[in-house]
């Protein structure tokens, strides 16, 4: 019977004539930076080319006995998970292995850097099809390792890494913390985060998604036909490397940004029990388990968006946090969140010729997060329109006045410490979809975009008094681009997008003792691209 | 693996080279910074990645590495260049005493220096 992990990543409702996994990934080369491997194992023979690259530290301990099968264990298993004949994800993918980990599974940042450089030079000498680099390793945060990963990613290489097995914030580790790398956490057969002894999978905003990583059957270096079960975020990353290889084989022109968006889009949503994560990390950790797309024909017609959380701003009065999109993504909206509710909103601003999302802490606040909604919108021309605080009782409003531009997101930013102490704002009048409205003492920022066939609509859901959380979702065929809250009072902790749902968090009245009758409304901006849909229909 | 301490292949004697006469201060602009792993047991002091500014050519990387060796030798320190990076990041990997970090940070073209550290199979 099919191993649980392969079943889990296989879409539940695929049509047999459309989706044939056995020979997936044949146009892609996957580089594995790991231990030595037993490349003639029956499961992977002929699929893995062992390069002559080796850069490993001496093993610890004077009496260390180098047992070949132990030296090869980790790498052989991972090669089997990626491309093994019987238990592999991308059975058609070819692999190249570089030895950067010694027989104890230990390597160095410098050895890994030299390995990445080797891959880049190989790519320049002999350009092939799409490349995936699997880094099933982790060390402490390293500026230089992250920088090298960024350079390689910008050279068109897809890097996939383990989130780490430290039951900790993945942002504290490298290469897991590199934004350009696809960072993978581990889940088990029950879709629970994996526990590994006293530790377990890492989590947090630096994780892109999770994948099967417990009791994963794969090639064992104990003998040429042996299989063994191993667990860890390396195994999870190997699944995603295999899925990436299959996606790239089906669509070799996919960019890293497109691939990442597809991985997120086709993942199983909201199946992980978040109670396992520390409370302060739950909102930051993606509730996504990787899966293969239901068809290898891609999904070019979709408008893909993802949510990117910034690092925490820290508690100082003027502290800010910045969330950035990838180079070929568009920032379509910007929101902010503070656990204490003390924040001064957010704004979209240009930085180095690209829009970023900046959130502002308030006096007495414990800090804020900026939340960017990053989307793939070909041929987009986006700009930010700002209205300064109106000061009049009408509230501040701004709209997209350029012809053909549609509203994709609203942000508001205020200088006063606590909007809640001021007169309540007026809710946005209905029937004006291209307009952002906010508190009269706030400046309002509208993200306005022109793109072929782009259409957007506003969807709201309000409740009479703050109840902890208000949500509004975009319907099938529409993608959430903007998520904001009305009004921007001190009750509102912030707004953020989770998949296609806009979540507005506010203080529960029962806990604050407030008697405010103020409504809290979640405002979603839902968009779709008729242009992308038409283009994909023409290809069919 | 690289040689043990004291068994260097490249001993640089304190010979005055033409380069050595050049100014030791970095070019105008921001000072180079030093980084090391926050997890103490994972640190590997004595090996450093010297990262040079983005547009630095291979020849400049090699020249900077040689300059570091020459200046270190003048102060009585042995250094060994383990690898010169090019293709992804400009820079070099050097085995040297931590005492030389201040000197290395002042070299021209240096963006930052990171102490080597361990990575582990996950």
């Amino acid at each position: 019977s099919i191993p649980w992990n392969l079943e889990r990543i296989t879409p539940p409702r695929y049509r047999a004539d459309e989706y044939q996994p056995p020979d997936g990934g044949s146009l892609v080369e996957v580089y594995l930076l790991d231990t030595s491997i037993q490349s003639d194992h029956r499961e992977i023979e002929g699929r893995v080319m062992v390069t002559d690259f080796e850069n490993v530290p001496e093993e610890d301990g004077t009496r260390f006995h180098r047992q070949a099968s132990k030296c090869d264990s980790h790498g052989t298993h991972l090669a089997g998970v990626v491309s093994g004949r019987d238990a592999g994800v991308a059975k058609g993918a070819s692999m190249r292995s570089l030895r950067v980990l010694n027989c104890q599974g230990k390597g160095t940042v410098s050895g890994t850097l030299i390995g990445l450089e080797f891959i880049r030079k190989s790519q320049l000498v002999q350009p092939v099809g799409p490349l995936v680099v699997l880094l099933p390793l982790a060390g402490g945060y390293s500026r230089v390792l992250n920088a090298a990963c960024q350079r390689l990613a910008r050279a068109g290489v897809v890097l996939v890494t383990a989130a780490g097995n430290f039951r900790d914030d993945a942002c504290l580790y490298s290469p897991a913390s590199a934004p350009e790398v696809i960072t993978v956490g581990a889940t088990n057969a029950q879709d629970q985060p994996v526990t590994l002894g006293t530790l377990g999978t890492n989590f947090g905003r630096c994780v892109d998604l999770f994948a099967p990583g417990e009791d994963i059957i794969g090639a064992s270096s104990d003998c040429s036909t042996c299989f063994v079960s191993q667990s860890g975020t390396s195994q999870a990353a190997a699944h995603v490397a295999g899925i990436a290889a299959m996606m790239l084989s089906a669509e070799p022109e996919l960019t890293l940004a497109e691939l990442r968006q597809r991985l997120i889009h086709f993942s199983a949503k909201d199946v992980i029990n978040e109670a396992w994560f520390p409370e302060d990390q739950r909102v930051l950790t993606p509730n996504l388990v990787a899966a293969l797309p239901p068809s290898t024909h891609g999904a070019g017609w979709q408008l893909f968006c993802r949510t990117v959380w910034s690092a925490h701003s820290g508690p100082t009065r003027m502290a800010t946090a910045i969330a950035r999109c990838a180079p070929d993504e568009e920032l379509l909206s910007c929101s902010s969140f503070s656990r204490s509710g003390k924040r001064r909103g957010e704004r979209m601003e240009a930085q180095g010729g690209k829009l970023v999302c900046r959130a502002h802490n308030a006096f007495g606040g414990e800090g804020v997060y900026a939340i960017a909604r990053c989307c793939l919108l070909p041929q987009a021309n986006c700009s930010v329109h700002t209205a300064p605080p109106a000061e009049a009782s009408m509230g501040t409003r701004v709209h997209c006045h350029q012809q053909g531009h549609v509203l994709t997101g609203c942000s508001s930013h205020w200088e006063v410490e606590d909007l809640g102490t001021h007169k309540p704002p007026v809710l946005r009048p209905r029937g004006q979809p291209n307009q952002c409205v906010g508190h009269r003492e706030a400046s309002i920022h509208a993200s306005c975009c022109h793109a072929p066939g782009l259409e957007c609509k506003v969807k709201e859901h309000g409740i009479p008094a703050p109840q902890g959380q208000v949500t509004v979702a975009c319907e099938e065929g529409w993608t959430l681009t903007g998520c904001s809250a009305l009004p921007g009072t001190s009750h509102v902790l912030g707004a953020y997008a989770v998949d296609n749902t806009c979540v507005v968090r506010s203080r529960d009245v029962s806990t604050t003792g407030s008697t405010s009758e103020e409504a809290v409304t979640a405002v979603a901006i839902c968009c779709r691209s008729r242009h992308l849909a038409q283009a994909s229909q023409e290809l069919q | 693996q690289e040689d043990e301490d004291g068994d260097y292949e490249e001993l640089v004697l304190a010979l005055r080279s033409e380069e050595d006469g050049l100014a030791e201060a970095p070019e105008h602009g921001t000072t180079a910074t030093f980084h090391r792993c926050a997890k103490d047991p994972w640190r590997l002091p004595g090996t450093y990645v010297v990262v040079l500014k983005e547009e630095t050519h291979l020849s400049q990387s090699e020249r900077t590495a040689r300059r570091l060796q020459a200046q270190a030798a003048r102060r009585g320190y042995l250094t060994k260049i383990l690898h010169v990076f090019h293709g992804l990041l400009p820079g070099f990997l050097v085995k040297m005493s931590g005492d030389l970090l201040e000197l290395a940070l002042k070299l021209p073209h240096v963006d930052y220096i990171e102490e080597d550290s361990s990575v582990f199979a996950q």
């Epitope: 056995p22 029956r42 004949r85 019987d86 040429s224 036909t225 | -």
Partner: antibody, heavy 115, light 109 residues
Framework: QVQLVQSGAEVKKPGASVKVSCKAS????????ISWVRQAPGQGLEWMGW????????NYAQKLQGRGTMTTDPSTSTAYMELRSLRSDDTAVYYC????????WGQGTTVTVSS | QSALTQPASVSGSPGQSITISCTGT?????????VSWYQQHPGKAPKLMIY???NRPSGVSNRFSGSKSGNTASLTISGLQAEDEADYYC?????????FGGGTKLTVL
């Protein structure tokens, strides 16, 4: 191109031993082991076992256990199959093939066991 | 390890299609993606025709195709030609070894 070249025909007496060689070329040796397959006259194919160029590990068919030894010499890119205590029913053509996938075959070595 | 079961012989006229079956158990054919088919002409070494159930090596005619259902694998030859007359062997992984079928003699009438 990928090639497996085997040693010449052998005639042996019962109870003797035979050692057949198989020289591999045209591919990365360590990516594949060598399988040994035999075919008695007028009979089908019988898998005898596998040997690794990477680490010398072996995987023998149960029927062969104890009587056969498979080895490799990576320095000469050659695999060997030795069969001891030969019997008349060991008369067969012995083939080497690349890996478990057996995608490339040697030309075969005829071993005749006759008194 | 007992051999996989193949019909001793099959025949067909030029241009016709024939199918050779290969039946094993869940421990071999049914349990692995690695069923191969070999063609052997008299006095020659076997030649790989199909690997991993359905895949054709480069240079093998697309008239040869493989499939599998449960514990039975099949080789289909369409547009039968005189040079297809040969012995055909299937082969599968088992948990620790490899097993061949007894062979099928294909006669082109």
């Amino acid at each position: 191109q990928v090639q497996l070249v085997q040693s010449g025909a052998e005639v042996k007496k019962p109870g003797a031993s035979v050692k057949v060689s198989c020289k591999a070329s045209g591919y990365t040796l360590t990516s594949y082991g060598i399988s040994w397959v035999r075919q008695a006259p007028g009979q089908g194919l019988e898998w005898m076992g596998w040997v690794s160029f990477y680490n010398g590990n072996t995987n023998y068919a149960q029927k062969l256990q104890g009587r056969g030894t498979m080895t490799t010499d990576p320095s000469t890119s050659t695999a060997y199959m030795e069969l001891r205590s030969l019997r008349s029913d060991d008369t067969a053509v012995y083939y080497c093939a690349r890996g478990y996938g057996m995608d490339v075959w040697g030309q075969g070595t005829t071993v005749t066991v006759s008194s | 390890q007992s051999a996989l079961t193949q019909p001793a012989s099959v025949s067909g006229s030029p241009g016709q299609s024939i199918t050779i079956s290969c039946t094993g158990t869940s421990s071999d054919v049914g349990g692995y993606n690695s069923v191969s088919w070999y063609q052997q002409h008299p006095g020659k070494a076997p030649k790989l025709m199909i690997y991993e159930v359905t895949n054709r090596p480069s240079g093998v005619s697309n008239r040869f195709s493989g499939s599998k259902s449960g514990n039975t694998a099949s080789l289909t030859i369409s547009g039968l030609q005189a040079e297809d007359e040969a012995d055909y062997y299937c082969n599968s992984y088992t948990s620790t070894s490899m097993v061949f079928g007894g062979g099928t003699k294909l006669t082109v009438l």
